[in-house]
């Protein structure tokens, strides 16, 4: 399907002008290539009428032009002095007329209505309000005032000053007679319907002295605003319906093939399940305006959308509406990224979030979509740091890999973390994307102790087991803070013999803190990555306490939480029997190593990678 998009149907009246806007993907090639407007002939050929290269056909000379707006991927064709002969089928497009990078447009030019002299024309959108002004002479001031609608050769009474109201206008029409001295009465019709369209006659008095005034009421369906957005991107519909409906329920609906309108979301709590996790209805302003944000755009989201107001929260005739025609461009600049990320309880996920690469300095955000109250999205983390305290120690936003992608890591997963999350920046709002986190059955691949208690001044060694499938990955330990996770110094592992023939149950990367200080207290993450792409992580909390027993031969520098199948050995090393493990953060063959040897040497914090059986050696 062509990525060029424009209005399918354009209608106007003889002598008037039209402005036709066509959209295209703003790639550098498209921005600079030829743009054209051509008319389709009976032969199927499309004859150029105007192009961006300055060509204007003789038929269009002096009344048409084409302007390209390369910065936003649009071009506009203006045609003036329309005649009935301009009705027909056209194409707006890029490149060569026959190449298919185009959009079909139907133009219909109709004859203007023949109106009686002195007719006042009122042009109003459906659902809105019109005030028809009816002047009269002083002698008709005390006499009956009335408004009629002309239907063919007959006139049907709509309303009069004797309290008659035509049933078709019940509860939405009123006749106002001003105080003395003002020689004009008004008829106000609310919630206009398409059927209200037509010629009206104001009348004051009767007989040959009566005052008459013709009014032509044109009730228009709102012209849909064209919206051109990228696949996987985001769209915002801003809906301003006016103060009259400020306190009425609002909705956004999508027109279906039967020409009825299916509710997408409304303020009464209804939401189409197809938009679950990727839609928000923003609270309305005091003037009744509101907006709806949809992220993770799909091709099937294309179509005609209406927003409106009605107490039922759905489309009803005669209530104000606004319209959009959404086109979803498949030649998207927004890269593919997983829309569903799966993790296991106790494990972790690393979510890749795209952003506009031209906005590398923009602030990055991650929020959790909540369906309650028409949807809302509390921020969890920003590139400036953590926002929600309940995510302390288990959530971090990283600028890597950069160049249009940032990473969010969430670990210590529970079933409550399942849900929809939005990737955001403070820049281009069209790059808002949605990811769903699903919690599935399974065990975390990385296994670390439960919470660890370290002794001040001693050495602490924390193991992190990883399976063979991660043997080629880079392993790291980092200390979490609310502004990120600072990688701890580690010797460059390089290729290791231990990993070449990976046939053991698991491998080990150890964090050594030597000597333990008060500042070491906090969350530590063990993780794997490939270049700038992050994989799984596991978190462990290290508490620091004073030496408890003075002068004893041995003090365990590391105590981990006891679990049902644990033995705490005299040597100060915790061992867990190789049984089914209930706490996913506990693992088989775990050893928290206490090194009470010479602590003067060695680094403050080091990461040592080795096999389970070779905890003393480090892999170089």
């Amino acid at each position: 399907k062509s990525p060029v998009f424009g209005p399918q149907e354009v209608s106007s009246v003889e002598g008037n002008s039209v402005s036709i806007k066509c959209y295209y993907p703003p790639t550098s090639v498209n921005r600079h290539t030829r743009k054209y407007w051509c008319r389709k002939g009976a032969s199927g050929r499309c004859i150029t009428l105007v192009s961006s290269e300055g060509y204007v056909s003789s038929n269009y000379a002096g009344r048409a032009n084409l302007t390209n707006f390369p910065e936003n991927g649009t071009f506009v064709v203006n045609i003036a002095q329309l005649s009935r002969d301009d009705s027909g089928h056209y194409k707006c497009g890029l490149g060569i007329n026959s190449r298919g990078l185009s959009f079909d447009v139907s133009l219909e030019v109709s004859q203007g209505p023949e109106l009686p002299n002195g007719t006042e024309v009122y042009t109003v959108d459906v659902g809105r309000t019109v005030t028809i002004k009816c002047p009269f002479k002083t002698e008709n001031a005390p006499k009956t005032k009335a408004l009629y609608k002309k239907i063919g050769q007959t006139s049907v009474l709509v309303i009069d000053s004797r309290n008659y109201v035509n049933p078709n206008y019940k509860d939405r029409i009123r006749l106002r007679i001003p105080g003395t001295g003002q020689l004009i009465f008004t008829v106000v019709i609310d919630r206009l319907r398409l059927s209200d369209h037509g010629l009206y006659l104001c009348q004051a008095g009767d007989g040959s002295n009566r005052d008459e005034k013709n009014a032509d009421l044109q009730v228009l369906e709102p012209e849909p605003e064209l919206v051109y957005e990228d696949l996987r991107g985001s769209v915002t519909f801003h809906c301003a319906l006016g103060l009259e409906v400020a306190n009425v329920a609002k909705f956004l609906c999508r027109v279906n093939s039967r020409e009825t309108c299916d509710v997408v979301i409304n303020t009464l709590g209804k939401r189409d399940s197809a938009f679950e996790g990727r839609i928000l209805l923003n609270p309305q302003d005091k003037d009744g305006s509101f907006s709806v944000v949809i992220t993770g755009l799909r091709k099937e989201d294309e179509g005609r959308y209406l927003c409106g107001a009605h107490s039922d929260g759905q489309l009803q005739e005669g209530w104000p509406i606004q319209a959009w025609q959404l086109f979803v461009n498949e030649e998207s600049t927004i890269p593919r990224s997983p829309t569903v990320v799966k993790g296991v309880a106790g494990g972790s996920v690393a979510v890749l979030c795209p952003y506009n690469p031209k906005e590398s300095q923009s602030l990055k955000y991650w929020c959790l979509w909540e369906g309650a109250q028409n949807g809302r999205c509390p921020l969890l983390v920003e590139s400036q740091g953590l926002v929600q305290e309940q995510y302390e120690g288990r959530l971090s936003l990283l600028q890597e890999p950069g160049n249009g992608t940032f990473t969010v890591i969430l670990n210590q997963l529970t079933t409550q973390d399942a849900g929809f999350y939005w990737c955001l920046t403070n820049g281009d709002t069209r790059w808002r994307t949605t990811v769903e986190i699903k919690i599935i059955e399974g065990e975390p691949n990385l296994k670390v102790p439960g919470n660890v208690t370290a002794v001040l001044g001693e050495t602490l060694n924390i193991p992190c087991h990883f399976p063979c499938k991660f043997s080629s990955y880079e392993k790291y330990w980092c200390k979490w803070s609310n502004t990120g996770c600072q990688t701890l110094p580690s010797q460059d592992e390089g290729p290791s013999e231990a990993f070449v023939n990976c046939d053991e149950n698991s491998r080990l990367v150890s964090l050594t803190l030597n000597p333990v200080t008060r500042a070491d207290e906090g969350w530590y993450w063990c993780g794997v990555k490939q270049g700038h792409f992050y994989g799984e992580t596991a978190a462990v909390y290290v508490a620091v306490e004073e030496k408890k027993v003075a002068g004893s031969r041995y003090v365990s520098p590391a105590k981990a939480d006891a679990a049902p199948d644990e033995k705490v050995l005299d040597s100060g090393v915790r061992e867990i029997e190789n049984k089914a493990i209930q706490d996913p953060r506990l693992f088989a063959e775990e050893k928290v190593v206490a090194d009470t040897g010479d602590q003067a040497g060695g680094s403050r914090a080091s990461v040592d990678s080795s096999s389970s059986e070779e905890q003393g050696g480090s892999s170089k």
């Epitope: 302003d285 602030l363 929020c367 400036q384 403070n426």
Partner: nanobody, 124 residues
Amino acid sequence: EVQLVESGGGLVQAGGSLRLSCAASGRTINTYVMGWFRQAPGKEREFVARIDWSGSSTDYADSVKGRFTTSRDNAKNTVYLQMNGLKPEDTAVYYCAGSAYYSGYVTHRDFGSWGQGTLVTVSS
């Protein structure tokens, strides 16, 4: 954590105007819903106004509708409350508050960051 500091309070005669400012530091607030609350002596803290992250949507307590207007300048990391037609019953300590919600329906309970407040006294 975002720090909020209110300024612009003072003594004003009934019918007069004041403009309160709320400057944020510590982080940008362009994705925060910002609110104004007030607490009169011996009374509970009450909602006055809120403005969404983009500035496109505002909401006011009935008692101040048509007289107070809130706005924001995300580039300056600042939120404003323009108070016109002040009445003696508007006398209170006015607090600025921030809520880390990117979008959507944010209730008055959702405000997590608070300023120290600025006193507004309206004399009759």
